[in-house]
Interface confidence: low
């Protein structure tokens, strides 16, 4: 009987000799759960794993705690990974987090991050972030010390408002922070004085909605 | 190059319903909220309703005029939108245009629909 | 529902001239109001959107200013191809809702 070959991101899915961009199988060593994630073959030498795509407003990313948890979406268009499989995947080594911005104008930028992890769900998923480089802006437009992250139904943000319920999406809310990639899709001519749209302020400023996003990671040693 | 198609327009009497649809290519389509705006003969411009994205639950505005008669929906699939007309008015006489999201950069040639017994 | 109110109604002008044409809002609209052309059995295009942005392809000579309330767009040398009607539109809250519009006719 031929051995099921398991990968548990993108990058082993590259080296396997898988160089084609789409959709791939992932699963976590020594667990028997699967997730179905979009791996970027292309993009700067390949082996990207998608954690998070927007591109056309077809997902509603106004979603609970558990659904974040465990990811939403279709991996071929909008979707989230899940925050549990990141969280676990980040922790077993060390990664990077490259997130690429488009703009309604056809004007590109994109954020690294040469150390990404997520703790676990217990301290609330909270980012962990160092050595910024890219053209989206010299601050991090994600709050730095990285923030818990929050839901409509789970309010971890340093706001006594709701940062999720009033900026729509859940996210690394500060009070509220600079950013938030999972907030309203607003079309084009629709995307300006939007304080709860598609948010990166150190590229953008605080009222664009961008028109797509995608955020990658890949092992640092790859 | 962008293209918006309207159809269905024709000759209803009053009480009588159409269906009118919008034909989109050119652009991409799922991005963008729809509306249809209205004009009378020799009148001005009327905004009649809105639909938005799959990620808005499709939320629809209608004007009051047209509010519980008039019905917006959009396929995704087929790059459609439509407008179904019940229960028409002499008034509601007038060509239909469709166009994208509000400023409105797209619009279609439009088609008459005419209320009369 | 916010009112637009155009004027005036209608204009004649000659080639060359300057022609401005205002709008005012029954409430404040920000700067959600766009500008538009309409030729007889056309659909109208769009010329200016959020009060003063040029849309794609539109000539420099026109220009659209003010917030708020009053709102202005302005063709500095009018051109033949420029006798049309003009409305002006707000789309900062439902119903969106457009003025009366203003024809531009040959002097």
């Known amino acids: 009987k031929e051995e099921q070959i398991s990968f548990r991101d993108c990058a082993e899915v590259f080296k396997s000799g898988h160089t084609t961009n789409g959709v791939y199988t992932l699963t976590l060593p020594n667990s028997t759960e699967e997730v179905k994630a979009y791996c970027d073959m292309e993009a700067g030498g390949g082996g990207w794993t998608i954690i998070q795509r927007r591109e056309d407003g077809s997902v509603d990313f106004q979603r609970t705690w558990k659904e974040y948890k465990v990811g939403f979406g279709n991996p071929s268009g909008e979707y989230w990974l899940g925050n549990e499989f990141v969280s676990q995947l980040t922790n077993q080594q060390r990664y990077v987090l490259k997130i690429h911005l488009k703009d309604w104008e056809g004007n590109e930028a994109y954020s690294l991050y040469e150390h990404f992890y997520l703790s676990s769900e217990e301290l609330n998923y909270r980012i962990h972030l160092k050595g910024l480089t890219g053209t989206a802006g010299k601050i991090s437009s994600i709050s730095q010390p990285g923030n818990d992250f929050s839901t409509k139904d789970a309010d971890n943000d340093k706001c006594i408002c709701k940062c999720s319920q009033m900026l729509t999406g859940g996210w690394w809310f500060d009070a509220c922070g600079p950013s938030n990639l999972n907030g309203m899709y607003y079309p084009q001519r629709q995307n300006t004085n939007k304080f709860n749209g598609i948010k990166w302020y150190y590229w953008k400023g605080s009222g664009y909605s961008l028109k797509g996003t995608t955020m990658m990671i890949r092992p640092a040693d790859f | 190059e962008v293209q918006l198609v309207e159809s269905g327009g024709g000759l209803v009497k009053p009480g009588g319903s159409l269906r009118l649809s919008c034909a989109a290519s050119?652009?991409?389509?799922?991005?963008?909220?729809m509306n249809w705006v209205r004009q009378a003969p020799g009148k001005g411009l009327e905004w009649v309703a809105e639909?938005?994205?799959?990620?808005?639950?499709?939320?629809?505005h209608y004007a009051e005029s047209v509010k519980g008669r008039f019905t917006i929906s959009r396929d995704v699939s087929k790059n459609t939108v439509y407008l179904q007309m019940n229960s028409l008015k002499t008034e509601d006489t007038a060509v239909y245009y469709c166009?994208?999201?509000?400023?409105?950069?797209?619009w279609g040639q439009g088609t008459l629909v005419t209320v009369s017994s | 529902d916010i009112q637009m109110t155009q004027s005036p109604s209608s204009l004649s002008a000659s080639v060359g001239d300057r022609v401005t044409i205002t709008c005012k809002a029954s409430?404040?609209?920000?700067?959600?109001v766009a500008w538009y052309q309409q030729k007889p059995g056309k659909a109208p295009k769009l010329l200016i959107y959020?009060?003063?942005t040029r849309h794609t392809g539109v000539p420099s000579r026109f220009s659209g200013s003010g917030s708020g309330t009053d709102f202005t767009l302005t063709i500095s040398s009018l051109q033949p191809e420029d006798f049309a009607t003009y409305y002006c539109?707000?789309?900062?809250?439902?119903?969106?809702?457009f003025g009366g519009g203003t024809k531009v006719e040959i002097k």
């Open positions: 639909i938005r994205l799959k990620s808005n639950n499709y939320a629809t």
């Open positions: 166009t994208d999201t509000a400023p409105f950069a797209y």
């Open positions: 050119g652009f991409t389509f799922s991005n963008y909220w």
């Open positions: 409430q404040d609209v920000g700067t959600d």
């Open positions: 959020w009060a003063s």
């Open positions: 539109q707000q789309y900062s809250s439902y119903p969106l809702t």
